[in-house]
């Protein structure tokens, strides 16, 4: 039994790091493999992650981590029974993929404006909380040519769009994702999309 593609890991910088790897052949990941991880730190303890299958030869493990900070470095040992298949390390702060924003809501009762709001996926005491910026994707299923990305570079998780910039009488969808500039993260996954109907009509000219 051997590792074909070494584990690569990303951290949500809150409580979970996800490691994925590929084996040389079909493997029952949860029955045959264990990923041991330990913070390189005083009085830290070794933890065991039971991997799940991710396709025929792929495995994925969700490592639980507390109080993730920039100095943290973990040793990783991949075992098949008594055989050490791979040994490596992982620094969560250098491989951050933020959690996806949630609770995306569209408010159309604001005059002449479509207001989108969503929730920051981190609690206020998390390091990423004040570092997230967002990208909001708006598109229309009725008008396949229409798709826009709005970059939200301020902290407040809101976006205002003049209703007049959208076609009246058709439906739109929106989704949002996040990244953290100072931690040089990748983009989060997109949030679930939300749909609304743009009923705004330009007032008649007097």
């Amino acid at each position: 039994m051997k590792v074909l593609q070494e584990p690569t890991c990303v951290s949500d910088y809150m409580s979970i790091s996800t490691c994925e790897w590929k084996m040389g052949g079909p493997t029952n990941c949860s029955a045959e493999l264990r990923l041991l991880y330990q913070l390189v730190f005083q009085s830290s303890e070794t933890h065991t992650c039971v991997p799940e299958n991710n396709g025929g030869v792929g495995c994925v493990c969700h490592l639980l981590m507390d109080d993730v900070v920039s100095m943290d470095n973990y040793t990783l040992d991949l075992w098949a029974g008594q055989q050490l298949l791979w040994k490596g390390s992982f620094k969560p702060s250098e491989h951050v993929k933020p959690r996806a924003p949630g609770n995306l809501t569209v408010h159309t009762n604001v005059s002449d404006t479509v207001l989108l709001t969503w929730s920051n996926p981190y609690p206020p005491d998390n390091y990423l909380y004040n570092d997230l910026t967002y990208a909001v994707n708006i598109w229309s299923e009725n008008d396949p040519a229409y798709s826009r990305i709005h970059n939200v570079t301020y902290l407040k998780p809101t976006l205002r769009i003049p209703a007049s910039t959208l076609k009246s009488g058709i439906s739109y969808r929106a989704r949002v994702r996040a990244w953290a500039q100072h931690y040089n993260t990748t983009w989060s996954e997109w949030s679930p999309s939300t749909k609304w109907y743009n009923s705004y009509r330009e007032p008649f000219e007097q």
Epitope: Q42, S43, E45, D66, D67, V69, M71
Partner: antibody, heavy 116, light 111 residues
């Protein structure tokens, strides 16, 4: 909000032991390491050791090895620091502090006076 | 005896800027991250800066930190009388067994 409530002031004789408690609330107790540090009157801060509340593992500063014991009770979210063979130079304010590589939150401190 | 050296005292007038240095070595500041703590008279220390230059929520941006080589600096702008306190730098010794270190402390007086 996070609170670290420490036990009250103690007066001890040289050679005795003291046990200081630090009760945590407002966060997941087993998710954060707890440090102990002390500050002698008019002096700076001195690190004593650390406990991992999750499993109870400890690590102590070399200066206090053999004299200090840190324990925790997860049922009450409390950590304890016991210092034995007390001498006059152990007179200090003893702090518990939540954190790992740095110290996010501190208890108000417990004054331990060692005097014959 | 701490291996992180700070000036014993600094002073400045309200509204002014003051800096506090923290000098260490290659096995501590040079190979680790720096934090800063404020200790108001008669109270416990409070985290001001972590990760060399990051502020916890609730700490005003008048406080900033930087690190270069084996030394670090805390800067306080727009000094207020309420800033009068002792300030300590902190880092980790990485030479053998890792353990935290505190600086000697600096008393800030607002004139």
């Amino acid at each position: 909000q996070v609170q670290l409530v420490q036990s009250g002031a103690e007066v001890k004789k040289p050679g005795a032991s003291v046990k200081v408690s630090c009760k945590a609330s407002g966060y997941a107790f087993t998710s954060y390491y707890m440090h102990w540090a002390r500050q002698a009157p008019g002096q700076g801060l001195e690190w004593m050791g650390i406990i991992n509340p999750s499993g109870g593992s400890t690590s102590y500063a070399q200066k206090f090895q053999g004299r200090v014991t840190m324990t925790r009770d997860t049922s009450t979210s409390t950590v304890y620091m016991e210092l034995s063979s007390l001498r006059s130079e152990d007179t200090a304010v003893y702090y518990c502090a939540r954190g790992k590589w740095w110290f996010y939150d501190w208890g108000k401190g417990t004054l331990v006076t060692v005097s014959s | 005896q701490s291996v992180l050296t700070q000036p014993p005292s600094v002073s400045a007038a309200p509204g002014q800027k003051v800096t506090i240095s923290c000098s260490g070595g290659s096995s501590n500041i040079g190979n680790s991250y720096v934090s800063w703590y404020q200790q108001l008279p008669g109270t416990a220390p409070k985290l001001l800066i972590y990760d060399n230059n990051k502020r916890p929520s609730g700490i005003p941006d008048r406080f900033s930190g930087s690190k270069s080589g084996t030394s670090a600096t805390l800067a306080i702008t727009g000094l207020q009388t309420g800033d009068e306190a002792d300030y300590y730098c902190g880092t980790w010794d990485t030479s053998t067994t890792m353990y935290p270190l505190f600086g000697t402390g600096t008393k800030l007086t607002v004139l």
